[in-house]
């Protein structure tokens, strides 16, 4: 581990490098060669890793195919129409000692003698309860099987087995059918069988899957199902509140409050990448990008990234970048939320970037939340805060995020806290006092019931749990089309969202949030 990899001789020196030799079971005249590559070092672009592939011919001749572009996400396929002689193996040459090859396949030309004995695949249908002996359950080229021997209300399971010559495959996954009660593909949604949709086809990716499950970012209506992709259409629908940042803003679970940064300081900034852009809620339109090389195109309007240093420089200098997000109302943290616009991965690199996260309390003490892997697939990154119950609770006023790649772009940081509940204040209440969620403070205990004032919100519709405005009453406020919900507490704007609604609660004579609908 103490060896510097750049001062010892490489494992695969130029000009030839290392080679992997693979032999195939049957020599044949090839039509194509396919190679599956699963890893290429970061030092190589796609054209450098495989510097030659040689075909080993039965005649003793080695046929060089030259250098090849290889990628991890798509197999390399080389057409070999001109070879015209039997090949028994291949040699793959590389200068990359970390190159990983998963498989190689040599495909023969048409009508090769090896295939003359081959028979078409056959399929056998197996049923539980078993089919009658005289029922032809082996299908040849016709892949349709009709079962006529059924009883109403009975449960049947079917499997398909593939037959090649005398060999049989493992049975397929089973399909269960209750005769007379419908099935996935009949256009009727059988909720009792776990169906969420039924569009009468067996295609994945159209909103309703092969197994009649609704696919992510789709909504399906009617029978047979008609599915549409809703994410990003500008309409915040009930079912997408938790999933669509574009349409509904950032989802905050009930009982929690998300505060976005009200101020920020960063380690590296200039006029091209100012730190202040991470203040407030992130832009909904920003899609997280991975494997980038250049962040100059418009990212700095929505997100901060350390633009003052290049990626190669930061790696050689082992630079650490950081940002501090400050919050206007120190709270007991339940989670920290980090929104990414890029996840720090470099084009041609497999390495995922990590961030280190700390909470800073009102006494300037640091509380470590650990290292977290960044990925656009897991965006926003939600980091739960686990409190040591043997220690006093603390109010967090800032979050520090540090990382080592200048290709990390962050568009927002939020502090998630408990709505109407403050363990620090709660623990400070004296005898004769009780914690008031409305005041967020300790108040002298009083038994008289205090009603809330009438709730009046312009440009909104109200749906209240009762006509009384007693302690615990709840009203749901929904803004009319074209208006944006502004949610405040103690004159601090805590959230601005395009829809669809917010619930306010009457607590000891006060509504727990002030709500307005702004154009």
């Amino acid at each position: 581990s103490a060896v510097n990899p750049h001062t010892v001789p490489p494992a695969c020196p130029e000009p030839q490098g290392c080679y992997l030799e693979l032999e195939f079971l049957y020599p044949l005249v090839p039509e194509s060669l396919t190679i599956w590559v699963t890893f290429v070092s970061t030092d190589w672009d796609s054209s450098g890793a495989v510097n030659d592939i040689k075909l080993l011919a039965v005649s003793g001749k080695n046929i060089s195919l030259g250098p090849q572009n290889v990628f991890c996400d798509v197999p390399l396929t080389i057409r070999l129409w001109d070879v015209g002689e039997e090949v028994y193996g291949i040699q793959i040459y590389t200068l990359d000692e970390h190159l990983e090859i998963d498989a190689a396949m040599l495909t023969s030309t048409a009508d090769t003698p090896l295939c003359l004995q081959c028979k078409p695949l056959k399929y056998k249908v197996v049923r539980d309860p078993p089919l009658q002996m005289d029922v032809a359950s082996i299908l040849h080229l016709n892949r349709k099987f009709v079962d006529m021997d059924l009883n109403l209300g009975s449960v049947y399971q079917y499997w398909v087995i593939t037959i090649s010559g005398t060999e049989e495959s493992e049975p397929s996954p089973a399909v269960t059918y209750i005769h007379g009660s419908g099935y996935c593909g009949d256009g009727i949604i059988q909720k009792d069988q776990g169906e969420q949709c039924d569009d009468m086809n067996k295609i994945n990716g159209d909103g309703c899957s092969l197994f009649c499950r609704q696919e992510v970012s789709f909504n399906c209506i009617d029978e047979p199902s008609r599915c549409y992709f809703h994410d990003g259409d500008g309409v915040c629908e009930e079912f997408e509140q938790k999933t669509s940042i574009k349409d509904c803003g950032v989802y905050t679970p009930q009982g929690f409050l998300d505060q976005w940064a009200s101020n920020a300081s960063v380690s590296h900034q200039d006029q091209q990448c100012p730190g202040w852009v991470i203040i407030g809620q992130p832009a909904a339109s920003q899609v997280c990008r991975t494997k980038v090389i250049d962040l100059s195109e418009g990212i700095s309007q929505h997100a901060w990234y350390p633009c003052t240093i290049s990626y190669p420089y930061s790696q050689l200098a082992q630079t650490t970048f950081w940002l501090r997000a400050y919050f206007s109302q120190p709270m007991v943290a339940a989670a920290v939320i980090v929104h990414l616009v890029t996840d720090g991965t470099y084009y041609g690199d497999q390495k995922q970037e990590t961030i280190s996260v700390q909470l800073l309390d009102t006494k300037d003490q640091s509380h470590d939340l650990g290292l977290h892997v960044l990925s656009c697939r897991n965006n926003p990154l939600i980091i739960p805060v686990v409190h040591d119950l043997s220690q006093p609770f603390y109010h967090s006023q800032a979050v520090r995020v540090s990382f080592s790649s200048p290709l990390v772009a962050i568009s927002g940081v939020a502090l998630r806290s408990f709505d109407n509940f403050d363990p620090v204040t709660l623990s400070s209440c004296q005898r004769g006092e009780t914690y008031s969620p409305a005041e967020q403070s300790c108040v002298h205990f009083a038994c008289e019931k205090t009603d809330c004032p009438e709730l009046a919100v312009e440009n909104a519709s109200l749906n209240c749990s009762s006509s009384d405005r007693y302690h615990g009453a709840q009203c749901t406020v929904s803004c009319r089309t074209g208006y944006v919900l502004q949610i405040r507490r103690d004159d601090e704007l805590i959230k601005s969202q395009t829809g669809p609604s917010v619930t306010v609660t009457c607590t000891e004579g006060k509504w727990n949030k002030q709500v307005a609908c702004e154009p």
């Epitope: 510097n4 091209q272 090389i293 195109e297 990626y311 050689l316 200098a317 084009y347």
Partner: antibody, heavy 123, light 107 residues
Framework: QVQLVQSGAEVKKPGASVKVSCKAS????????MHWVRQAPGQRLEWMGW????????KSSQKFQGRVTITRDTSASTAYMELSSLRSEDTAVYYC????????????????WGQGTTVTVSS | DIQMTQSPSSVSASVGDRVTITCRAS??????LAWYQQKPGKAPKLLIY???SLQSGVPSRFSGSGSGTDFTLTISSLQPEDFATYYC?????????FGGGTKVEIK
């Protein structure tokens, strides 16, 4: 003033190795990066690799990977570039050039260059 | 590798002329581009770094601009000592690569 002084011209046979030195003065050697660049006759400049003179970490161009070794002697404020398995096409002028500060960069690019070392590879 | 393409490969100009040299990268390189001047038999000299920052001691008639893939070096009023070859170089991705050079000659 800041300067880089390189070793003298070399004539080598194919297959041999050459080691070029670059002595730094006028600045804190270990606070900066050091690049190596070469230029064949009538050709464009070609980057070979660089080193963090403080940590000794290096990165070289894949074209030279395995043939080029960049090292340093901090006590002598000297950087070295060794190129092995020489071939005729390695005939060129080899330059060392100071890169940015590895602590608090205020500039980028290669701001100070050595005078160059001519290496001739011939049988 | 990122290819750096300079144009023109040579330009003939007179003292006092405004000269513009362009450099195009085959992929985006943000602002990580430097410009160098090289005279025959001499080592290159850094003129501009980070696309537009003037290196200390370099006359203000030299200026750089651009971001992403397209960059420009401008000499606002050519002086006799400016006749040389100019190279651009990217340092956004390994390996760092240079352009083919633009020779500025006396008309």
């Amino acid at each position: 003033q800041v300067q880089l002084v390189q070793s003298g011209a070399e004539v080598k046979k194919p297959g041999a190795s050459v080691k070029v030195s670059c002595k730094a003065s006028g600045y804190t050697f270990t606070s900066y990066a050091m690049h190596w660049v070469r230029q064949a006759p009538g050709q464009r400049l070609e980057w070979m690799g660089w080193m963090n003179a403080g940590t000794g970490a290096t990165k070289s161009s894949q074209k030279f990977q395995g043939r080029v070794t960049i090292t340093r002697d901090t006590s002598a404020s000297t950087a070295y570039m060794e190129l092995s398995s020489l071939r005729s096409e390695d005939t060129a002028v080899y330059y060392c050039a100071r890169g940015p500060s590895m602590e608090t960069p205020t500039t980028f690019g290669m701001d100070v260059w050595g005078q160059g070392t001519t290496v001739t590879v011939s049988s | 590798d990122i290819q750096m393409t300079q144009s023109p490969s040579s330009v003939s100009a007179s003292v006092g002329d405004r000269v513009t040299i362009t450099c195009r990268a085959s992929q985006g390189i943000s602002r990580w581009l430097a410009w160098y001047q090289q005279k025959p038999g001499k080592a290159p000299k850094l003129l501009i770094y980070a696309a537009s920052s003037l290196q200390s001691g370099v006359p203000s008639r030299f200026s750089g601009s651009g971001s992403g893939t397209d960059f420009t070096l401008t000499i606002s009023s050519l002086q006799p000592e400016d006749f040389a070859t100019y190279y651009c170089q990217q340092e956004n991705a390994y390996p760092f690569t240079f352009g083919g050079g633009t020779k500025v000659e006396i008309k």
